[in-house]
Structures are given as C-alpha cells and as structure tokens.
C-alpha cells in the first residue's frame, strides 16, 4: 500500500504556536496525482476538503489550508489525509496547534518555526471516525 499511497505529512506555517488573531497555514503533502486533500480536526471531528492541489516537487503535491485569524477554539490536533483515485490514503501523524495570548503584532517573532509531522509506523486499521460537514470546495469531473 505504501508504494502508491505513502502516508501524507502535515506542517504548519509559520509554526505550531500561534498568537491569538494571527494567521496560520496548514500544509498537507502527498504524492503526485492527489485529487483531494482533507484536513481533519479530530477533537471536534470536523474537516475541510480542497481540490486546490499544487505540485510541490516532481514527486510531491501539496494543499494549503489557511486560518486568517486564529481563535482559541482553533487550538487542537490536526492531521491530513488524501484521495488519489480510487483510494484514500492513511492519515498523517497529528500536529498540535497551540494558541497563545498575543504579545506583539500579528507577525511578531514569538511563533515557533514551522513544525511538521511525517510518516511513522502504519496504523493497524485504515478506517476512520465519522466527520462533521465541511466547507464547499471546487468542482471537478473525471473519467475512467
């Protein structure tokens, strides 16, 4: 399974400790050919899907999920999964987002540098939890 469906990785820019009101972007990465990236927020069983996938390198694609103004409620565990037809990948490791009281401007240097979570050992099951509704993404049609 890992050959054509490597586990995705997740990272956060500018980091995983974000001042209240600042922005953060989650970056999900997977192989070339991904149709949909899904960012899951496990603590609330919510997710966001996107088909806005770009090529990060000859062998890697990525999608970016931006939160413009971070609130306390955005703190928690995040992970990525992708759909490369006709298969869902396994989930990435968790990345924890911490939100702290702002002590400076939106881009003050008290954010930690970008952190990421990549592949580790394979989980014993490829089934996941239920999810709550997501935001509307792009529409596409494919033929096979």
């Amino acid at each position: 399974q890992e050959e054509d469906l490597p586990r995705p990785s997740i990272s956060a820019e500018p980091g995983t400790v974000i001042p209240l009101g600042s922005h953060v972007t989650f970056v999900c990465r997977g192989p070339v050919g991904v149709q949909t990236f899904r960012l899951e927020r496990d603590s609330r069983s919510t997710y966001n899907d996107t088909e806005d996938v770009s090529q990060a390198s000859p062998s890697e694609s990525e999608a970016r999920f931006r939160i413009d103004s971070v609130r306390e409620g955005n703190a928690g565990l995040y992970r990525c999964i992708y759909y490369k037809p006709p298969k869902w990948s396994e989930q990435s490791d968790y990345l924890e987002l911490l939100v702290k009281e702002s002590s400076g401007g939106p881009d003050s240097p008290d954010t930690e540098p970008g952190s990421s979570a990549g592949p580790t050992q394979r989980p014993s099951d490829n089934s996941h939890n239920e999810h709550a509704p997501a935001s509307q993404g792009l529409k596409a049609e494919h033929l096979y």
Partner: antibody, heavy 118, light 107 residues
C-alpha cells in the same frame, strides 16, 4: 445507524429518462463519496461512478458517461442518479453505496429496480 | 479494466462446513480486494476489506486471504444465515470492478 434509503421501482418506456434517489442518514453526508452500482443478470455488478458531496467532484466509469448523471442535494443529504435514453439493456437493479476510508463500499442502499419496457 | 473472475458460480455445502470462495484478478491489485455478501432479498453487506480486514459487526467465522492476483474468502463454520451470493471487488485501479459472484447453497 448508517442508512441509505433508495426510491422505489420504476417502469419506464424506451428512450425515456429516469431519476432515482438515495437518501443518507446516520452519518455526515458530505464526508463520504457516494457511489452507484448496476446489477443486471447478464453482467453481474458494474461500477457506474461516484460523487464527492463535499467538493462536488465526480468520477464516472467511461462506460456509463453518456448514460448516467450523478448529482447531490446537500440540504436533504440525498444523492441522485439520472439515466437517459433508456433501452432494455438498462433494465437492472441500481444500488447506491457509501465509499469509506477502508476503500470499500461499506454501506449499501436496498436497490432500485428499473424496468425498461414498451 | 481489471477483470475479476470467480470461477465457481455456485457452490453447495453442508451446515458446519468450511467453505472457501476464490477470486482472481487479471493483474496485481496490491491487496485492494473486498468481499460482499448479497442475500436473496438483494441486501448487500461488506464483509472484508483490504483482503483480510473484517468489517465491523461481521462474524469472525468469515476470513479473507490472498495477495497479488489470487484471493479467497473462507467461512469456517457454515451457518444457515450465510446462504447468499458472494462478490469480490478490486479497488486498486479505476474503474472499480467486481467478480461475477459465487452463489452458496445448502446441500
């Protein structure tokens, strides 16, 4: 409990169209792809295509591209499949099925019998 | 398209028997092989996904094995409620394809 409730049997004339529905309950409708499968005595089970309620993305089996149109209504958690230019070869039972992260059709509707006859 | 072949279209067995149903793919499907049970009333249920993983609520007498192109479903202790038709399905490439089914009957 996950349930997929399909619309009732249809008797339609050759050349006509039919639209069958699949109402989902017991889970987040937008979180899972909805697939459609045809079962006829001659060809067993055939995959028609899938629609992703979250993004609206659709993938068709090339064989059914000119025959089937997949749509969804998120407000009612219902998936639809329209079949057009019907012939006797389209007489079959059609199933909707939820495609899960396990990369399988984990839940199926009860099936809708479509009979094409003059 | 990948062809899925279930060479045995019907199979007779006695209650309590160990029954094995085979499925062959026309090319390597990397273990993306699922098994479904269809009851006489048309109800379809997932039994096993990814070759050998039991779907929730499925009795442990069902098991799956295989690799590459050859796969099998085993019912270790046949019960009356297992009378049904069993289909394999590959999910490695599009279009997803099914085997022709194996109808299991009681002797």
């Amino acid at each position: 409990e996950v349930q997929l409730q399909q619309s009732g049997p249809e008797l339609v004339k050759p050349g006509a169209s039919v639209k069958i529905s699949c109402k989902a309950s017991g889970y987040s409708f937008t979180g899972y792809f909805m697939n459609w499968v045809k079962q006829s005595p001659e060809k067993s089970l055939e995959w028609i295509g899938e629609i992703h309620p979250s993004t609206g993305s659709i993938i068709y089996n090339q064989k059914f591209k000119a025959k089937a149109t997949l749509t969804i209504d998120k407000s009612s958690s219902t998936a639809y499949m329209q079949l057009k230019s019907l012939t006797s070869e389209d007489s079959a039972v059609y199933y909707c099925a939820r495609f899960d992260y396990s990369n399988s059709f984990a839940y199926w509707g009860q099936g809708t019998l479509v009979t094409v006859s003059a | 398209d990948i062809q899925m072949t279930q060479t045995t279209s019907s199979l007779s067995a006695s209650l309590g028997d160990r029954v094995t149903i085979s499925c062959r793919a026309s090319q390597d499907i990397s273990n993306y092989l699922n098994w479904y049970q269809q009851k006489p009333d048309g109800t379809v249920k997932l039994l096993i996904y990814y070759t050998s993983r039991l779907h929730s609520g499925v009795p442990s007498r069902f098991s799956g094995s295989g690799s590459g192109t050859d796969y099998s479903l085993t019912i270790s202790n046949l019960e009356q409620e297992d009378i049904a038709t069993y289909f394999c399905q590959q999910g490695n490439t599009l279009p997803r394809t099914f085997g022709g089914g194996t109808k299991l009957e009681i002797k």
